[in-house]
């Protein structure tokens, strides 16, 4: 699979990690998260042209079949390959606790 | 997360497992796979409306941010949650071998 820098569609247009700033209100978390007030959400965004960052053989098949049957089979999709744990200070019944979420922030991306 | 049967967009339109019939030629495998001549490829296809089959917290965040910034943040995408192994009879330098691929056929789907 090609790496993230040689996107055939032009620089930065293919599947890669982006950071989107979001408030607790944006995320619908204002009623249970105390801190941080704003989150730098890392997510996978971008196109998945042929064999670009293909996660596995399924992604390769998907590319081939999308080429043949574009109306039936979608192109591979840019999704997290792994995550960074994220710590939140949140409200609990008994007060405040430190809670870590494993599946919140994308760490790197691939096409599947 | 809602299960696969209560798609708010109408029956069968949300993220679920589909089977697509493909020949070795379709897949670009004709020069290295001997059998089967045709593959029933199971793949994940369909829309991912709000919280439908959300894989994790990242998917929930993506839904929230897509609602706020649809031009920047894509909706979650329907991808395999797990795979079924598939056995192929393939050509090798020395003749023929039986090879199992773990990441070829989708077993079930979720939105991420």
């Amino acid at each position: 699979a090609r790496n993230g820098d040689d996107c055939p569609l032009g620089p930065g247009r293919c599947c890669r990690l982006h950071t989107v700033r979001a408030s607790l209100e944006d995320l619908g978390w204002a009623d249970w998260v105390l801190s941080p007030r704003e989150v730098q959400v890392t997510m996978c965004i971008g196109a998945c042209p042929s064999q670009f960052r293909a996660a596995n053989m399924h992604a390769q098949i998907k590319t081939s079949l999308h080429r043949l049957k574009p109306d039936t089979v979608p192109a591979p999709c840019c999704v997290p390959a792994s995550y960074n744990p994220m710590v939140l200070i949140q409200k609990t019944d008994t007060g405040v606790s430190l809670q870590t979420y494993d599946d919140l922030l994308a760490k790197d991306c691939h096409c599947i | 997360a809602r299960n696969g049967d209560d798609c708010p967009l109408g029956p069968g339109r949300c993220c679920r497992l589909h089977t697509v019939r493909a020949s070795l030629e379709d897949l670009g495998w004709a020069d290295w796979v001997l059998s089967p001549r045709e593959v029933q490829v199971t793949m994940c296809i369909g829309a991912c409306p709000s919280q439908f089959r959300a894989a994790n917290m990242h998917a929930q965040i993506k839904t929230s941010l897509h609602r706020l910034k649809p031009d920047t943040v894509p909706a979650p995408c329907c991808v395999p949650a797990s795979y079924n192994p598939m056995v192929l009879i393939q050509k090798t330098d020395t003749g023929v071998s039986l090879q199992t691929y773990d990441d070829l056929l989708a077993k079930d789907c979720h939105c991420i």
Epitope: P85, V87, T100 | -
Partner: antibody
Framework: QVQLQQPGAELVMPGASVKMSCKAS????????MHWVKQRPGQGLEWIGV????????SYNQKFKGKATLTVDESSSTAYMQLSSLTSEDSAVYFC???????????WGQGTTLTVSS | DIVMTQSQKFMSTSVGDRVSVTCKAS??????VAWYQKKPGQSPKALIY???TRYTGVPDRFTGSGSGTDFTLTISNVQSEDLAEYFC?????????FGGGTKLELK
């Protein structure tokens, strides 16, 4: 550059209280949380708790509830930890450490050596 | 509380060697593990977070790996300045807990 300054030592009588400081510089104080960690001589590290420097929310290790109280003074970019009802078990080095949502404990102070003795 | 076990209290090495410090969690902590280096009389220095991500400025001879319950800090091409104590820490669930430390010494 990021710096967390702590006094080198404190000598306190048993039964008394002590309030140790941790002065931050080189970054925006309220952008990060402040954690406190204990190290007894010849032993490992123990996490005491954390304070959100902008809102003063605190979360403690159950073991240190009632023993440690974390506070901040935004105006001087200083975090404080008060330890009460001191005994010889509280004699240790206490570190403050800057923390975030992903980077955990990325910068540490030099530590304050607390000696509880009569 | 989650117990982090560093079974080797001491490890002997030589300059230029490759050494692996291990850490075992008493339950699954995902990748919420950090590694620190501590020299006598100094404050801990953060090396790795999220099990495998190096902090800015940490030499690339330090590599973290693992997930779930088993974690490793590998130092390739050990330098004299790497002789120190190494601690793992989990931040998967509160209270955060540290391993007992592994001291790296010269053979």
């Amino acid at each position: 550059q990021v710096q967390l300054q702590q006094p080198g030592a404190e000598l306190v009588m048993p039964g008394a209280s002590v309030k140790m400081s941790c002065k931050a510089s080189g970054y925006t104080f309220t952008d990060y949380w402040m954690h406190w960690v204990k190290q007894r001589p010849g032993q490992g590290l123990e996490w005491i708790g954390v304070i959100d420097t902008s809102e003063s929310y605190t979360s403690y290790n159950q073991k240190f509830k009632g023993k440690a109280t974390l506070t901040v003074d935004e105006s001087s970019s200083t975090a404080y930890m008060q330890l009460s009802s001191l005994t010889s078990e509280d004699s240790a080095v206490y570190f403050c450490a800057r923390g975030g949502t992903t980077v955990v404990l990325d910068y540490w102070g030099q530590g304050t050596t607390l000696t509880v003795s009569s | 509380d989650i117990v982090m076990t560093q079974s080797q209290k001491f490890m002997s090495t030589s300059v230029g060697d490759r050494v692996s410090v291990t850490c075992k969690a008493s339950q699954n902590v995902g990748t919420a593990v950090a590694w620190y280096q501590k020299k006598p009389g100094q404050s801990p220095k953060a090396l790795i977070y999220s099990a495998s991500t190096r902090y800015t400025g940490v030499p690339d001879r330090f590599t973290g790996s693992g997930s779930g319950t088993d974690f490793t800090l590998t130092i390739s091409n050990v330098q004299s300045e790497d002789l120190a104590e190494y601690f793992c820490q989990q931040y998967s669930s509160s209270p955060w807990t540290f391993g007992g430390g592994t001291k790296l010494e010269l053979k």
